[in-house]
């Protein structure tokens, strides 16, 4: 069974600074990536990037930089001040879509004891679902 | 949980029409397009019909003239009729929702599918 990863990691440099980071684990070819904070995409949660493998990026504030690393991962450099600003427990949801097969989602958020900078490599996170 | 359900697929004569109905639950969309899709037996998918939040709307060259997309934002819903249908129309028809890149609508979520049946 195909499953996305997350990992979170606040930069050392600039506290208000995050990169989050997806994997999709699976066979397909991937459509879209989309990308959210606050909880999964259409159940809460606000859109910060949207990725086409062919067609492009769209990205919003504050997320300032979403690439793609392979044809299976993408970051996503979030950068706020304020009320835009994400802060160490917010949760962030990639899901990896291949239309027509299937689409997969998993969230994740900074580690509770994790120093800026830090991180553990990333590992598979729940699938929160597969459509 | 975002669920999209197609319904109005079946089998048609050729010439014969159908129309098709989408209903949206269980999420508040934040894409920008919704749209009809298509695969036909072993052939890639398709898009046939697309309308973004402004009211835009493109059709597939195939099916312009004959199948008409509109939506009704109060029921959640996105509709397709399918008028002189033709053989070559026969496929498996996808509601779908997601954002527009280039001008084209790229799905991030669909339904099951609907199968629709031209033949006489």
């Known amino acids: 069974t195909p499953e996305v990863w997350v990992q979170v990691r606040m930069e050392a440099t600039e506290l208000s600074s995050f990169t989050i980071r997806c994997g999709f684990l699976g066979s397909g070819s991937i459509s879209l990536v989309t990308v959210s904070w606050g909880g999964p995409n259409g159940a809460g949660g606000t859109t910060l990037a949207v990725l086409h493998p062919e067609r492009g990026i769209r990205q919003w504030a504050p997320a300032r930089q979403a690439r793609w690393e392979t044809q299976s991962s993408i970051s996503l450099i979030l950068e706020g001040s304020g009320a835009s600003s994400p802060c160490a427990n917010t949760t962030f949801c990639c899901k990896f879509a291949s239309f027509p097969e299937g689409s997969w989602e998993a969230c994740g958020s900074l580690p509770p004891s994790s120093d800026p900078g830090l991180s553990a490599p990333p590992t598979p996170a729940p699938i929160l679902r597969a459509d | 949980e975002v669920q999209l359900v197609e319904s109005g697929g079946g089998l048609v004569q050729p010439g014969g029409s159908l129309r098709l109905s989408c209903a949206a639950s269980?999420?508040?969309?934040?894409?920008?397009?919704m749209g009809w899709f298509r695969q036909a037996p072993g052939k890639g998918l398709e898009g046939v019909a697309t309308i973004d939040n402004a009211g835009r709307i493109k059709y597939a060259d195939s099916v312009k003239g004959r199948f008409t997309i509109s939506r009704d934002n109060a029921k959640n819903s996105l509709y397709l009729q399918m008028n002189s249908l033709r053989a070559e129309d026969t496929a498996v028809y996808y509601c779908?929702?997601?954002?527009?890149?280039?001008?084209?609508?790229?799905?991030?979520?669909w339904g099951q599918g609907t199968q629709v049946t031209v033949s006489s």
């Open positions: 269980g999420f508040t969309f934040s894409g920008d397009c």
């Open positions: 779908a929702a997601g954002w527009t890149f280039g001008g084209q609508c790229s799905p991030a979520d």
